[in-house]
């Protein structure tokens, strides 16, 4: 078996230019990886849209903390 | 491919500032943060303090604020990291790293600042 | 500022080993927790973040866990090129702090 994990790369290169209300927000990925030109966030709605977000803006990173603190809360 | 090329050895008087530098390669600073992080001998890593380069805007551990000054150069995609009023315990490697998330993939090979009269 | 004890600070295993690491955070840092990689006179390298998503590269002998305050790095089966000093960060709240190392050692 293979000893390292290959990751297909996905790549945010537009970022939406307006906040999300987090009651419409499910889960989010980290876009770290350096073949993509910037960091980025994936946010997947309730409806099952992803949406690419800048996580410099205050809002994404906000986002972000509510949506660990709520997986946090549903963990036994 | 991603390198942060760091600035030599520095010896420094006790008093003093030094001034480190982080060359960039492969990335655009603007899109991420610049954050320094320091290692004294046979210690652990401390944060020092991160930029925005896209606008300049810095965040220090309290125990820095003051006395640290980072700044970036987004024309050489460079950034710096000054401490002033230097003292022994400053002797350390200083080492720049990048992550908007506050976590650092990527990291220069290190600057050795000695402090000492 | 959220203080990182790690442990155990340093431990001694042998090549094939399952290697346990221990970090807990003074408050809750809801999977905000990196684990680095040091050898001696190198740059710490990115094995885990978000405590338990696996860098790109990093073989998958390296495991993370954990939730709340308490997190474990695992490598299931020591190999030569692992020795070296573990870190952990969070990065929940800055500034962000590190544990302050596990050094594994050869038996």
């Known amino acids: 078996q293979p000893d390292s994990v290959s990751i297909p790369i996905t790549c945010c290169f537009n970022v939406i230019n307006r906040k999300i209300p987090i009651q419409r927000l499910e889960s989010y990925t980290r876009i770290t990886n350096i073949q993509c030109p910037k960091e980025a966030v994936i946010f997947k709605t309730k409806r099952g849209k992803e949406v690419c977000a800048d996580p410099k803006e205050r809002w994404v990173r906000d986002s972000m903390k509510h949506l660990d603190q709520i997986f946090q809360n549903l963990k036994p | 491919q991603v390198q942060l090329v760091q600035s030599g050895a520095e010896v420094k008087k006790p008093g003093s500032s030094v001034k480190v530098s982080c060359k960039a390669s492969?990335?655009?600073?603007?899109?991420?943060?610049m954050h320094w992080v320091r290692q004294a001998p046979g210690q652990g890593l401390e944060w020092i303090g991160r930029?925005?380069?896209?606008?300049?805007?810095?965040k220090f551990d309290p125990k820095f604020q003051g006395r640290a000054t980072i700044t970036a150069d987004t024309s050489t995609s460079t950034a710096y990291m000054e401490l002033s009023s230097l003292r022994s315990e400053d002797t350390a490697v200083y080492y720049c790293?990048?992550?908007?998330?506050?976590?650092?993939?990527?990291w220069g090979q290190g600057t050795t600042v000695t402090v000492s009269s | 500022d959220i203080q990182m004890t790690q442990s155990p600070s340093s431990l001694s295993a042998s090549v094939g080993d399952r290697v346990t690491i221990t970090c807990k955070a003074t408050?809750?840092?809801?999977?905000?927790l990196a684990w680095y990689q040091q050898k001696p006179g190198k740059a710490p390298k990115l094995l885990i973040s978000?405590?338990?998503s696996l860098e790109t590269g990093v073989p998958s002998r390296f495991s993370g866990s954990g939730s709340g305050k308490d997190y474990t790095l695992t490598i299931s089966s020591l190999q030569p090129e692992d020795f070296a000093t573990y870190y952990c960060?969070?990065?929940?709240?800055?500034?962000?702090?590190f544990g302050g190392g596990t050094k594994v050692e050869i038996k």
């Open positions: 978000g405590a338990t």
């Open positions: 408050e809750d840092i809801y999977n905000r």
């Open positions: 930029i925005d380069p896209a606008n300049g805007n810095t």
């Open positions: 790293a990048r992550g908007v998330f506050g976590f650092f993939d990527y």
């Open positions: 492969g990335l655009n600073i603007k899109d991420t943060y």
């Open positions: 960060q969070q990065f929940w709240s800055a500034p962000y702090t």
